[in-house]
Amino acid sequence: TGADTEAVVCVGTACYTAHSGKLSAAEAQNHCNQNGGNLATVKSKEEAQHVQRVLAQLLRREAALTARMSKFWIGLQREKGKCLDPSLPLKGFSWVGGGEDTPYSNWHKELRNSCISKRCVSLLLDLSQPLLPSRLPKWSEGPCGSPGSPGSNIEGFVCKFSFKGMCRPLALGGPGQVTYTTPFQTTSSSLEAVPFASAANVACGEGDKDETQSHYFLCKEKAPDVFDWGSSGPLCVSPKYGCNFNNGGCHQDCFEGGDGSFLCGCRPGFRLLDDLVTCASRNPCSSSPCRGGATCVLGPHGKNYTCRCPQGYQLDSSQLDCVDVDECQDSPCAQECVNTPGGFRCECWVGYEPGGPGEGACQDVDECALGRSPCAQGCTNTDGSFHCSCEEGYVLAGEDGTQCQDVDECVGPGGPLCDSLCFNTQGSFHCGCLPGWVLAPNGVSCTMGPVSLGPPSGPPDEEDKGEKEGSTVPRAATASPTRGPEGTPKATPTTSRPSLSSDAPITSAPLKMLAPSGSPGVWREPSIHHATAASGPQEPAGGDSSVATQNNDGTDGQK
């Protein structure tokens, strides 16, 4: 395969193997996978230390590493097309064996974004520096390599193999050699923990001098989560050595008989296990029976135990596990209560903010306060809300009812305000007359004037404008002007505008008079009033959006 197992470290429920060999990340992963593992994860500082230990073991044996800065693949990769996410510790990379996004990271430098190709992570080792637990290998990101071209400075890779449990190393009470063969095909004579399903071959004796006695054991699950070899008593015991060789293979005490035989024993507070070698605490808490953050508390005389939960948690029916207390059951908050693991928090409804007397109290937000009013014009604060209002000549508009839109009095409900032409302005309107007519002093009616062929008379001066309240002068029942074929205004009996339903969007071209042009013979079409125009949505200037009718008496703003 182009890779040799040089080192192995087993700890907890996993073994890490370090391999030298210039392989691509895919080839390295395939090598780990063939033996039931994956490229190693480094999900915590502790795991980083385990990986560092196995690399240190490899480097002690490996003299031929070619680069001063060596890189070893780990199982952190980012697929092609998946972009960098700077907000995450893993920056959008994920562990090849699956699993959650973990909080630990140790990037060598700021990553450059590149989504074009697959990217892989290696551990960067400076071989000129000693490997210290305080100086953990940095993560280096780069191309994943290809067969025959692993990438710059790639010297090897680290695999991880997970197991349901581990056995303790076998205890030798006399001369002999243990060889462990792991499920991932590594052989070793010194493992601090031996993975489940490993085989142990024990050859007793001192080479050719003694006839060798051999034993074969398997690391198996003897009871739920109890992993053991099933051997009884120390192995390779010899009357020649008694307790002098490796403490007789005993875990704690070794007691010699007069005939060279010996027995293992335990210190006070411990008991000898079935293997007749290992001691376990008599303390019932030593087996960690409590779960979920519960603390084991010894009972009187150390006979039994109870589990105790941290604040905000209580024991479940098993009396071993802690479950969250739902503090919200007691209604500790004025408005909203959110239960959280081990506690709770109070929240306020929309329109309120934390404050006022007492824990979890809420007070009204004054949305109308200076500098924060959401309304375009008038704002009235209410308890937990507010509403907006508009000045004369405007109605509330906008999705949230906070904007004010000019009322087009020229097409408003209740019929026309002007006898003839009507010019809408922001917040007001003006009347005008057709050629040959002049505006009466009341600003609404038209009287016959000297014949003129010019454009319709424009808006009167400021002092002549129609009153917003509406004139008391009776309106003339004149025909509405429309366009003649030649483009000059002519009178027709009536024209009716389609009635508008209040929820229909208005997309038709505007009818609003934008003010007559100053150039002779050219004028823009005025809004022509029609008694038949239904009250309902009115087009805003420009005619390209629909605004629902709003009452002018103010409307609650949307929070």
């Epitope: 054991f217 398997l218 198996k220 009871a223 739920p224 989560d225 099933g230 779960r291």
Partner: antibody, heavy 118, light 112 residues
Framework: QVQLQQSGPELVKPGASVKISCKAS????????LNWVKQRPGKGLEWFGR????????DYNGKFKGKATLTADKSSSTAYMQLRSLTSEDSAVYFC???????????WGQGTSVTVSS | DIVMTQAAFSNPVTLGTSASISCRFS???????????LYWYLQKPGQSPQLLIY???NLASGVPDRFSSSGSGTDFTLRISRVEAEDVGVYYC?????????FGGGTKLEIK
């Protein structure tokens, strides 16, 4: 499919020994615990002991300590239980039972009846 | 050793109705890994026992879903929702938490 085939009934005299067998098929014999369970006539079930054929590791119920020796032959996928110094108390049906990965006794042999009588 | 207590006989049940069999242990069977190592076996007349339920509430292969089991660390109940004639026999609870493995005395299901 998994099968456990036990040897036939035995009629033995008090003080004698008997060796009963259990031939396994349909699974990796070396990798599962093989349990022996005793059932006296009209009575309940009692766990007698077990063997791990992979390395011959055994565990016995202290109540029956010294009464039996459990062995296994990997080449023939057969487990044996030798009972010694038989008394009428040992008259029972003995079942061999596979222990699975969930610690359940999932497959049972048909049982071997041992009758101790003079 | 862990000791379990079972009633020798169930209350006689009518076919099609439900039945409950209970079992009490001298020690909690809930392991610190969160698994409860309780098992139920049925021995029909003249047959070898068969596994019904493993690890407190999991149905063994081929067992109809009329069977269910529940309980806490020490008290457990096997329920048969609609008893059929083929359900008659002796029901044993067992623990595989600690050696030696132990069985309850067995409860005989009786039909009215």
């Amino acid at each position: 499919q998994v099968q456990l085939q036990q040897s036939g009934p035995e009629l033995v005299k008090p003080g004698a020994s008997v060796k009963i067998s259990c031939k396994a098929s349909g699974y990796a014999f070396s990798s599962y615990w093989l349990n022996w369970v005793k059932q006296r006539p009209g009575k309940g079930l009692e766990w007698f002991g077990r063997i791990y054929p992979g390395d011959g590791d055994t565990d016995y119920n202290g109540k029956f300590k010294g009464k039996a020796t459990l062995t296994a032959d990997k080449s023939s996928s057969t487990a044996y239980m030798q009972l010694r110094s038989l008394t009428s108390e040992d008259s029972a049906v003995y079942f061999c039972v596979r222990g699975d990965g969930y610690w359940a006794m999932d497959y049972w042999g048909q049982g071997t009846s041992v009758t101790v009588s003079s | 050793d862990i000791v379990m207590t079972q009633a020798a006989f169930s209350n006689p049940v009518t076919l099609g109705t439900s039945a409950s069999i209970s079992c009490r242990f001298s020690k909690s069977l809930l392991h610190s890994n969160g698994i409860t190592y309780l098992y139920w076996y049925l021995q029909k007349p003249g047959q070898s026992p068969q596994l019904l339920i493993y690890q407190m509430s999991n149905l063994a292969s081929g067992v109809p879903d009329r069977f269910s089991s529940s309980g806490s660390g020490t008290d457990f109940t096997l329920r048969i929702s609609r008893v059929e004639a083929e359900d008659v026999g002796v029901y044993y609870c067992a623990q595989n938490l600690e050696l030696p493995w132990t069985f309850g005395g067995g409860t005989k299901l009786e039909i009215k």
